[in-house]
Interface confidence: low
């Protein structure tokens, strides 16, 4: 038991400390008082605290706790924030390069297709970017639209260059024929599979990182309960009321208080562990057709192969399409 | 095969590499992130202990405060919480998490389920044919030799893959703040909360 304060004891030390905490306020007793109105720092004898001081201590204790929590999560928070930003930018760079590679392939191999091809390729990769960022676009529709748009240009510029390229009638017929006749063989299906799988995984990876940020932000900005505030005040500040300015809380006592204050937060632990391990599993599986870097940067080659496939079947296709779209062509020549 | 479009449309600045010791791909980046994240796997269970170790606690002193009185650091009284007749620590724990914490737990459950679904190896075996062969038979018209297949990865491998460090403005080993200029640069310094209280400890 600490000895009771000597009769000449004043609250000078407590006063000067409290003044720094709350400048200009005269809430500190000159000399120790009974403190019968105190609700948190219940005195065993005369005390240098008043009810107002107690309130200020509670406020400060909760603020300290919030700051300590933010300090604790700072490194983790920046790790995830930063990676989310880096990966988002990196994915955009992959998309940009994939578009550039595809455009370069058209420019070098099929210069006559370039103006329109560039446009269709650009639209396709814009959709890819939007999908990664969470847009509600269907990947199969994106791929179909790319090939539907490309085929009329390939037909009019490469397979049948004598046709005028201005009329829309034949274009609509050619778009339909593209699917009915499987003009590009199985390449569109191959691209759909690869692109949809790699983009799906990429999208969920980014979603998971963004949720990680949300988790940390949530716990970072928790407001602690009044009960917790009282416990923290007793631990950190009630000793001051007895003039014990230099004494620190016992370690075991601190752990008990913190476990009480953070009981709710600690419940996240199980799901947080599972989150990291599930994310690890996802990352370990992000290769081959599940790796968008691999898939998108090779798309130019697959698209080139698909056009070569059309070229190799051009004779048969021209005859079939000539019959199929004859009505549209006649209307054009009139 | 297609004319390899190297250098044609790629910004020249991409190729200016700052201190990259090896070819960095996104996959190595992802693995690096997971390794770093795994060091935080016990983050939430360790929080109470972390906060105690980063706030003033008696370490070398003989005496310490137990909420009611000054006691010897290793005595029975030191671990007592000094809260009897005030508010029950057990009650505080029984209240359960705040609604905002419950919400975030639900979101975590949902994303964990999604992540597990996406990682399911069973689902992948079914795709393997498409991935490796590229085509089902009979899909290529009359001449089977016209089938241009997606062997291996179903595509030509792009040389070196991208050296992403060269393009990105920041590298995770030499990282600056997130894209948001409002944010501070990362560091894990303890915010000196108690310094605000007049350096009493």
């Amino acid at each position: 038991q600490p000895p009771p304060p000597p009769p000449d004891a004043t609250c000078h030390q407590v006063r000067s400390f409290f003044q720094r905490l709350q400048p200009g306020l005269k809430w500190v007793p000159e000399t120790p008082v009974p403190g019968s109105d105190l609700q948190v720092c219940l005195p065993k004898g005369p005390t240098c605290c008043s009810r107002k001081m107690e309130e200020k201590y509670q406020l400060t204790a909760r603020l300290n706790m919030e700051q300590l929590l933010q300090s604790a999560s700072m490194e983790l928070k920046f790790l995830i924030i930063q990676n989310a930003a880096v990966f988002q930018e990196a994915f955009e760079i992959v998309v940009r390069h994939a578009k550039n590679y595809t455009n370069a392939m058209f420019k070098n191999n099929y210069p006559s297709l370039t103006p329109q091809a560039f446009e269709f390729v650009g639209e396709f990769f814009t959709d890819v970017s939007l999908y990664i960022l969470g847009s509600d676009i269907n990947v199969d529709d994106m791929v179909n639209e790319l090939f539907d748009s490309l085929f009329p240009v390939i037909y009019t510029q490469l397979m049948n260059p004598g046709l005028p390229d201005s009329a829309l009638d034949i274009n609509e017929c050619l778009r339909g024929a593209r699917r009915d006749l499987k003009v590009f063989g199985n390449f569109p299906k191959l691209i759909m599979t690869q692109v949809s799988k790699s983009l799906q995984v990429t999208r969920i990876f980014l979603q998971a990182l963004n949720l990680g940020i949300e988790v940390i932000n949530t716990t970072d900005h928790l407001k602690f309960s009044k009960d917790c505030g009282r416990m923290l005040t007793r631990m950190w500040y009630c000793s001051y009321c007895q003039g014990l300015m230099m004494v620190k809380p016992c370690g075991g006592y601190c752990n008990v208080v913190m476990q009480g204050c953070m009981a709710g937060v600690v419940e996240i632990d199980k799901y947080w562990r599972e989150y990291i391990l599930s994310l690890e599993e996802l990352v370990n599986g992000m290769y081959r057709i599940y790796d968008m870097e691999n898939v998108l940067l090779g798309l130019f080659s697959t698209i080139h192969d698909s056009i070569q496939y059309v070229q190799k079947n051009a004779g048969k296709l021209t005859t079939t399409i000539g019959k199929l779209c004859a009505h549209s062509q006649q209307r054009q020549y009139r | 095969s297609a004319y390899y479009p190297e250098d044609l449309f790629i910004d020249k600045k991409v190729l200016k590499v700052a201190h990259v010791e090896h070819e960095e791909t996104l996959s190595s980046r992802r693995r690096e992130l997971i390794q770093k994240l795994k060091s935080f796997i016990s983050f939430y269970s360790a929080l109470p202990g972390y906060i105690c170790s980063h706030s003033p606690v008696a370490e070398n002193d003989t005496l310490c405060w137990n909420g009611q009185e000054l006691v010897e650091r290793y005595s029975q009284k030191a671990a007592r919480n000094g809260m009897k007749n005030q508010f029950n620590l057990h009650e505080l724990k029984m209240k359960g998490p705040e609604p905002v914490v419950s919400q975030i737990i639900d979101k975590l459950k949902h994303i964990n389920q999604l992540l597990r679904t996406m990682s399911m190896p069973k689902g992948r075996v079914l795709d393997k044919n498409l991935d490796e062969e590229g085509f089902e038979s009979g899909d290529c018209g009359d001449d089977e030799d016209e089938c241009i297949g997606g062997s291996g990865d179903g595509m030509i491998k792009v040389k070196n893959q991208l050296r992403f460090l060269a393009e990105l403005a920041y590298d995770l080993d030499v990282d600056d703040a997130p894209g948001n200029s409002q944010q501070a640069t990362p560091k894990d310094n303890e915010i000196s909360t108690f310094h605000n209280l007049g350096n009493v400890h």
Epitope: - | V174, D175, D176, A177, S181, K187, D188, N189, I191, S192
Partner: antibody, heavy 120, light 107 residues
Framework: EVQLVESGGGLVQPGGSLRLSCAAS????????MNWVRQAPGKGLEWVSY????????YYADSVKGRFTISRDNAQNSLYLQMNSLRDEDTAVYYC?????????????WGQGTMVTVSS | DIQLTQSPSFLSASVGDRVTITCRAS??????LAWYQQEPGKAPKLLIY???TLQSGVPSRFSGSGSGTEFTLTITSLQPEDFATYYC?????????FGQGTKVEIK
């Protein structure tokens, strides 16, 4: 009194190694990130390296990456800089500096510096 | 890397003068800029951080302003102890970089 004291400087040949130490006192060393900054004779300041309080996050300037290693021992209140493959251009006064504890970074406490001379 | 360019590099002034030093960043650094003072043979001393926040113990004649890419350090009434070299530093992104310095000499 808050203080940082560097030691370990001296004359070393190109290609050689040196280990600098920085002893901290008067503050909770384990709660602060720490930096090394150097200043070549008659020149300006150049940031060299940073370590977070837990050593989980470490950064280097391009000019020293792969040659210098920053480390710390929180139990000993000490910061270190292991310098290998030293070059003439590494000749400088090396300061250790504390990273401020607030939201915004700044080097609020500096040591007096230790001179490193690389010469054959 | 972000380059910081201070101007002027040398400045001659008299006691009581108002002095302004400019620091330009090669790209936007928001408000992540600090100013240091270094006397010959001594370690640098932090004057201002976060563009305009005065470090405790630094006289109020020192002030900082700016944002983005253009920043200034102002000494309203130069005192004898202010003759020194001043450096700006960006802390927006790694590697952290310093300006080349501005030497304030007695006229």
């Amino acid at each position: 009194e808050v203080q940082l004291v560097e030691s370990g400087g001296g004359l070393v040949q190109p290609g050689g190694s040196l280990r600098l130490s920085c002893a901290a006192s008067g503050f909770t060393f384990s709660g602060f990130g720490m930096n090394w900054v150097r200043q070549a004779p008659g020149k300006g300041l150049e940031w060299v390296s940073y370590t977070s309080s837990s050593s989980r996050t470490i950064y280097y300037a391009d000019s020293v990456k792969g040659r210098f290693t920053i480390s710390r021992d929180n139990a000993q209140n000490s910061l270190y800089l292991q310098m290998n493959s030293l070059r003439d251009e590494d000749t400088a006064v090396y300061y250790c500096a504390r990273d401020s504890s607030g939201w915004y970074d700044a080097f609020d406490i500096w040591g007096q510096g230790t001179m490193v001379t690389v010469s054959s | 890397d972000i380059q910081l360019t201070q101007s002027p590099s040398f400045l001659s002034a008299s006691v009581g003068d108002r002095v302004t030093i400019t620091c330009r960043a090669s790209q936007d650094i928001s408000s992540y800029l600090a100013w240091y003072q270094q006397e010959p043979g001594k370690a640098p001393k932090l004057l201002i951080y976060a563009t305009s926040t005065l470090q405790s113990g630094v006289p109020s004649r020192f002030s900082g302003s700016g944002s983005g890419t253009e920043f200034t350090l102002t000494i309203t009434s130069l005192q004898p102890e202010d003759f020194a070299t001043y450096y700006c530093q960006q802390l927006n992104s790694y590697p952290w970089t310093f300006g080349q310095g501005t030497k304030v000499e007695i006229k």
